[in-house]
């Protein structure tokens, strides 16, 4: 396993309507063909996964159903949006690439976008 | 140019097992997914998985789990999909396509079902 | 899964017409991809990331859309365009096509 660097944004602060969108780039040593991402929450030092791809020569990443990701690639560059957020989802989110293919087998982990999430505040009632 | 050829048709008995294989030239194998479709007579189209060849990734389509099975011999350049306890409403025209963007597809292996 | 609702089902047309199709998708996608059959021959990509043409596909034909509302566009209808189109999306597993509209040329 060979270490790679990936860059992603320190902070992203999430719309009204709990959407997050991040870029992910990774310094590929070579022309990688099928590139795995994932993308982990942490929160009070636990890890947990969000989502994960796995694309190849497309521009459109493809995640399992019900998943809250979607995305996009161009070139080193992956484009993530995360959908659904609420305060309690707040955290650090840290972009892992692989790349899984041809080899050697690449590793890179980022430092982490920490989101911020504000619930928007319900409409006062109105009159009309 | 790029070019997928599948096996010719078939005819099998219910409860037997088939090998379909889509063989690709043209390009580089490991590039690529190979996407397998079924389409029923006068049906629509339905997305059975793909298997990344590098590597032997594989996503099915939960309707197909435990149906079908996806693999790659890269050495040959070809792809396989092998259908089991096979059934009537196996019997269908089966597609292999190349990439994300389903941009070649094979002609098409006609199945069919009959005891 | 995302189930694409394709509309209409059938539809004829004169050739110099326009036609239009339409693909909704249960919940939001990021692209839609639109492919061409004719009868006992293989889907061809017509339309890939909502709106760009494949390789070949003459500009009477064009996609838009956003979400989970898309549509494909003939502007001049030619009688070789009588086929079956299917919409697919890519954004989740597992991909998923709509149930196709078959395209009358009269």
């Known amino acids: 396993c060979k270490a790679m660097h990936v860059a992603q944004p320190a902070v992203v602060l999430a719309s009204s309507r709990g959407i997050a969108s991040f870029v992910c780039e990774y310094a590929s040593p070579g022309k990688a063909t099928e590139v795995r991402v994932t993308v982990l929450r942490q929160a009070d030092s636990q890890v947990t996964e969000v989502c994960a791809a796995t694309y190849m020569m497309g521009n459109e990443l493809t995640f399992l159903d019900d998943s809250i990701c979607t995305g996009t690639s161009s070139g080193n560059q992956v484009n993530l949006t995360i959908q659904g957020l609420r305060a309690m989802d707040t955290g650090l989110y840290i972009c892992k690439v692989e790349l899984m293919y041809p080899p050697p087998y690449y590793l890179g982990i980022g430092n982490g976008t920490q989101i911020y999430v504000i619930d928007p505040e319900p409409c006062p009632d109105s009159d009309f | 140019q790029v070019h997928l050829q599948q096996s010719g048709d078939v005819l099998v008995k219910p409860g037997a097992s088939v090998n379909l294989s889509c063989k690709a030239s043209?390009?580089?194998?490991?590039s690529y997914w190979i996407n397998w479709i079924k389409q029923r007579p006068g049906q629509g189209l339905e997305w059975?998985?793909?298997?990344?060849?590098?590597?032997?990734?594989?996503y099915y389509n939960e309707m197909f789990t435990g149906k079908a099975t996806l693999t790659v011999v890269t050495s040959s350049t070809t792809a396989y999909i092998h259908l089991n306890s096979l059934s009537f409403e196996d019997s269908a025209v089966y597609f292999c396509?190349?990439?994300?963007?389903?941009?070649?597809w094979d002609q098409g292996t006609t199945l069919t079902v009959s005891s | 899964q995302i189930v694409l609702t394709q509309s209409p089902a059938i539809m004829s047309a004169s050739p110099g017409g326009k036609v239009t199709i339409t693909c909704s998708a249960s919940?939001?996608?990021?692209?839609i991809h639109w492919f061409q059959q004719k009868p006992g021959t293989s889907p061809k990509l017509l339309i890939y990331?909502?709106?760009t043409l494949a390789s070949g596909v003459p500009a009477r034909f064009s996609g838009s859309g956003s979400g989970p509302s898309y549509s494909l566009t003939i502007s001049r209808v030619e009688a070789e365009d009588a086929a079956t189109y299917y919409c697919?999306?890519?954004?989740?597993?597992?991909?998923?096509f709509g149930g196709g509209t078959k395209l009358e040329v009269r």
């Open positions: 396509a190349r990439g994300d963007y389903f941009d070649y």
């Open positions: 043209g390009y580089t194998f490991t």
């Open positions: 059975i998985g793909r298997i990344a060849p590098g590597s032997g990734t594989t």
């Open positions: 919940k939001s996608v990021s692209y």
């Open positions: 990331d909502t709106s």
């Open positions: 697919q999306q890519r954004t989740t597993y597992p991909l998923t």
